[in-house]
Interface confidence: low
């Protein structure tokens, strides 16, 4: 905390216009306290929450907010079906403005946003948005929590019923029901471009009572992609007068925000009353302590499939501020090399950044499939030895998946390395949420929007007469998943292998919870079309004896090219693109840039929002993914993989599960669960494409050279 003078955090963004005095007619609610003489209150000190009751008696009530939501105590309420949002997809008008109220930053909504469903008694109109945050570096700042897990920021949207009241303030003053949505923001390694107008606005209201108009934004983009999983309870305003009139909707899935964006919240100032004077200090930790549930019941939504991916990827492996800590960035430069007909060598390089040294050893996990079974093994490798591992008794008709994780003290783990798929004779291309078998031209009117052609420059390499094929996948499990030692076999998604279309001795599909934990999203796919991955033999046929050596030229090429791709956040929420604002654009190669231009201009048979993932279908279990839940359900079980002891060899059986995937729904902004689409004839893959590296996720730096492609993916 700090108090202070004319001094405040500086910000260096461009001009943010301030409101003119004559245009402040809409600040009635926010300024009401001054006019009505409402009691002064604060988040700490003599006027802090424990003292609110002295001037606002409702603050001592038994149905107060916020609360900690215990998932296992919440009951599914059949009445809590899907939310109906109206107007949320529209761009906000230029009259929408933001104000630093001294207690929060509020957005006064000037457009018509309506919500109904979710057990709300009517059609409610959004009035304002408020934020609550912590003090620094993603510290806990949310008011609500789930299973004790708090988040850096909580956004609250307040609603009233316009059929009953002419204003939000009237509803409150008459103690009538209002609605409120709580949305958690979780730290992500990348900026969330959907938040740009909000962050820009924050920089325009650094000081208490400052106001600014906001650049247009889409309110829907500030919500989680999946709205199906939410909690419901009856509570109160979390600030005086603490009226117990609020129907709370607390979304389970968070929205990503980067540390850089969080700083805009931490740089807000307030004036705090101390006795008869005020002093300036940072507005931080503006959350009310949690209140007792007492006789209330928290309900969970009954939206079909909304909770399928719940505990394993969210609660047990939390996305909250106390989530499993990673001790380093991922091992990099993953390579797989056949030593002979029956042996493979996996090599990698140590992580670029070690947060909690030293690295004690590495855990190599690999799974394979044979005769309808998936098997899993892990073993460890001391960190002071060559960073290589040999897998013997390799069968050419099995699909192998490899990943490596550094193990530090106290069993802290790194992020997982990229996942490597390996199988003889058949190339698997992992792109978007598809696995595509090369050289199998089939028809699909929309597939060109989802898969980019692979250059015929791709090459085959063989050893001892066995042609091996290889795919590097963008799994890049981040801190949110690295803490759970899920088995390798448990992280290949149903989409991944259902898309393979194996028959005979192959796999029909893998269970829903299997690799990878994070698939490239639709926005990533759109980038990839402009960056078709070039496969070469040099990248892995001869990695050389020094596994610590710098990446090959091919790898470096992709490292640069990858800068364009907005990777998914640690909470797995959504990939973010800042087409025009990302300074990294300037560093891209001309070829990549040209391809990106092609991306922007080519027609899109299946357009999708740049802020929506291609993996939003409700039944695909990809831990941490944002998912809409309007897709039809499947038989897919919510399988949770067992934990792995990294120091012991294990072999885990994971029964396969067949799935059928469909498109159902046509919202182009939020496509439903991707279908298992065959390739169109327009998507030609060379028959000899045997080694493809698909962009790794955010923290992985190894890869193959990128190069332009005429293809496009939206």
């Amino acid at each position: 905390v700090l108090h202070y003078v004319v001094c405040f955090p500086a910000l260096t963004e461009g001009y943010v216009g301030t409101l003119q005095e004559s245009r402040q007619d809409s600040s009635v609610q926010i300024r009401r306290r001054k006019a009505s003489g409402d009691p002064y209150w604060a988040y700490s000190g003599a006027y802090g929450p424990e003292h609110w009751v002295t001037s606002s008696v409702s603050c001592g009530g038994s149905h107060q907010s916020p609360i900690d939501i215990l998932d296992h105590h919440a009951r599914v309420g059949d009445e809590y079906q899907e939310l109906q949002l109206d107007g949320f997809d529209n761009e906000s008008s230029n009259k929408t403005w933001m104000k630093n109220t001294g207690k929060t930053v509020a957005i006064l909504l000037k457009d018509d946003y309506f919500v109904s469903g979710a057990g709300l008694p009517g059609r409610f109109k959004a009035e304002k948005v408020e934020f609550h945050w912590g003090h620094s570096n993603g510290s806990a700042g949310s008011e609500h929590s789930v299973n004790g897990r708090r988040f850096p920021v909580e956004m609250q949207i307040f609603f009233y019923n316009p059929d009953d009241f002419d204003s939000f303030q009237t509803a409150i003053s008459e103690n009538r029901i209002i609605g409120a949505m709580a949305i958690f923001f979780q730290v992500s390694p990348r900026d969330n471009s959907a938040l740009d107008p909000i962050i820009h606005g924050l920089k325009g209201v650094v000081h208490h009572e400052k106001e600014t108009f906001l650049d247009p934004f889409i309110l829907r983009d500030l919500l989680p992609a999946s709205l199906g999983s939410y909690y419901r309870y009856t509570g109160s305003l979390t600030t005086p007068p603490c009226s117990e009139i609020v129907e709370w909707i607390v979304f389970r899935r968070p929205v990503p925000i980067s540390y850089h964006q969080l700083e805009a919240f931490y740089s807000i100032f307030t004036t705090e009353q101390q006795d008869h004077v005020k002093s300036v200090e940072y507005l931080r930790n503006n959350f009310r302590p949690q209140q007792a549930l007492n006789d209330r019941v928290v309900s969970k939504s009954a939206v079909r499939d909304a909770w399928n991916h719940d505990l394993a990827d969210f609660l047990d492996n939390p996305l909250g501020t106390e989530a499993s800590k990673v001790c380093s960035s991922p091992p990099i430069h993953m390579k797989v090399q056949p030593l002979n007909q029956t042996a493979l060598q996996v090599s990698w390089s140590q992580p670029e950044t070690i947060y909690h040294p030293p690295i004690m050893n590495y855990m190599i996990s690999y799974s394979w499939t044979k005769n309808e079974d998936e098997k899993e093994k892990t073993f460890t490798k001391d960190s002071d030895k060559d960073l290589k591992a040999t897998i013997s008794h390799v069968s050419p008709d099995s699909l192998y998946l490899f990943r490596v994780q550094a193990v530090c003290r106290n069993d802290m783990r790194s992020d997982f390395s990229q996942t490597m798929l390996f199988q003889a004779n058949t190339t698997r291309i992992f792109q978007g949420t598809r696995i595509v078998k090369t050289g199998v031209p089939t028809a699909s009117p929309a597939s060109s929007a989802d898969m980019a052609p692979i250059s015929s420059g791709s090459s085959t390499w063989t050893s001892s007469g066995i042609p091996f094929s290889f795919v590097s996948m963008a799994t890049g499990m981040g801190p949110s998943s690295s803490g759970s030692q899920a088995t390798v076999a448990s992280v290949v998604t149903s989409t991944l292998l259902a898309g393979l279309g194996f028959g005979g001795g192959g796999i029909s599909s893998f269970p829903s919870t299997v690799w990878p934990t994070r698939l490239p999203t639709a926005s990533a796919a759109s980038k990839q079309a402009g960056r078709t991955v070039l496969a070469t033999t040099e990248a892995l046929a001869s990695p050389g004896p020094d596994v610590h050596s710098a990446p090959s030229k091919d790898s470096e090429g992709t490292e640069e090219g990858e800068k364009e791709e907005k990777s998914e956040s640690e909470d797995g929420e959504r990939e973010h693109e800042e087409e025009e604002k990302d300074s990294e654009k300037k560093e891209k190669s001309e070829a990549t840039h040209t391809a990106a231009e092609s991306d922007r201009t080519a027609p899109a048979p299946t357009p999708s929002s740049p802020h929506r993932t291609a993996a939003e279908g409700g039944h695909q279990t990809i831990p941490g993914r944002r998912q809409d839940h309007s897709a039809p359900a499947t038989d897919q079980p919510g399988h949770v993989a067992p934990d792995l002891d990294p120091l012991v060899d294990t072999a885990t059986q994971v029964p396969p599960t067949a799935t059928e995937e469909h498109y159902s729904g046509s919202d182009p902004r939020r496509p439903e669960m991707p279908s298992k689409k065959p390739m169109s004839r327009g998507d030609r893959f060379s028959e000899d494409s045997k080694f493809i590296t698909v962009n790794p996720a955010e923290k992985n730096t190894s890869g193959m050279l990128s190069r332009p492609s005429p293809g496009r993916m939206e």
Epitope: V6, C7, P9, H208, K210, S279, V280
Partner: antibody, heavy 115, light 111 residues
Framework: AQSLEEFGGRLATPGTPLTLTCTAS????????MSWVRQAPGKGLEWIGT?????DAYYASWAKGRFTISRTSTTVDLKMTSLATEDTATYFC???????????WGPGTLVTISS | SFVLTQPASVQVNLGQTVSLTCTAD??????ASWYQQKPGQAPVLLIY???SRPSGVPDRFSGSSSGNTATLTISGAQAGDEADYYC?????????????FGGGTQLTVTG
């Protein structure tokens, strides 16, 4: 009337540590953020640092390490070390009020650093 | 670093209105305050939070802010208004807290 007064300014040689003290009359120092501002002869105003009501202090980048602000319920001190000739200035003790402004200034105390 | 820019000197005829400006790249985001300093005296607060005037300050002094410019307007300038005028605001980030004064404007009242 509310007022501030600074003490401790004097002629000193380079490298000599010096402590300035500020006292208030007519109001309690403890409830305000207090700052030190200096002004070299013929020059403009220069903020040195601020201490909040809770005791947390912030400094100008050039002042960090050499200047320390502390407070008691009745005084606010500015400790200066490694003084150089360019630190010659009138040092003002200032009260922050109205949210974002210095509303009461002491008359200032002159510190002259000369060898 | 963050800089508040003020004209070094401004002249005004007695009884006329004069506007003193203070600019910075990001001034729109924060409040400006204005101080008057007469030779040999401590500064006096004239305007805080862009436009507010403390009690005791004549209403001839007014403040405004538009975009990245804060303006102090003195109407009906008097000989006693001859002084140096400083604007102030801040620079820094969440972990770095810096107050900034402008270089000051010397106002001369002629006639």
């Amino acid at each position: 009337a509310q007022s501030l007064e600074e003490f401790g300014g004097r002629l000193a040689t380079p490298g000599t540590p010096l402590t300035l003290t500020c006292t208030a009359s007519g109001f309690s120092l403890g409830t305000y953020s207090m700052s030190w501002v200096r002004q070299a002869p013929g020059k403009g105003l220069e903020w040195i640092g601020t201490i909040g009501g809770r005791g947390d202090a912030y400094y100008a980048s050039w002042a960090k390490g050499r200047f320390t602000i502390s407070r008691t319920s009745t005084t606010v001190d500015l400790k200066m070390t490694s003084l150089a000739t360019e630190d010659t200035a009138t040092y003002f003790c200032v009260r922050e009020n109205y949210g974002y402004a210095f509303d009461i200034w002491g008359p200032g105390t002159l510190v002259t650093i000369s060898s | 670093s963050f800089v508040l820019t003020q004209p070094a000197s401004v002249q005004v005829n007695l009884g006329q209105t004069v506007s003193l400006t203070c600019t910075a790249d990001t001034l729109s985001r924060r409040y400006a305050s204005w101080y008057q300093q007469k030779p040999g005296q401590a500064p006096v607060l004239l305007i805080y939070r862009d436009t507010s005037r403390p009690s005791g300050v004549p209403d001839r002094f007014s403040g405004s802010s538009s975009g990245n410019t804060a303006t102090l307007t003195i109407s009906g300038a008097q000989a006693g208004d001859e002084a140096d005028y400083y604007c102030a605001t801040s620079d820094g980030s969440g972990s770095s807290y810096q107050c900034v004064f402008g270089g000051g404007t010397q106002l001369t009242v002629t006639g």
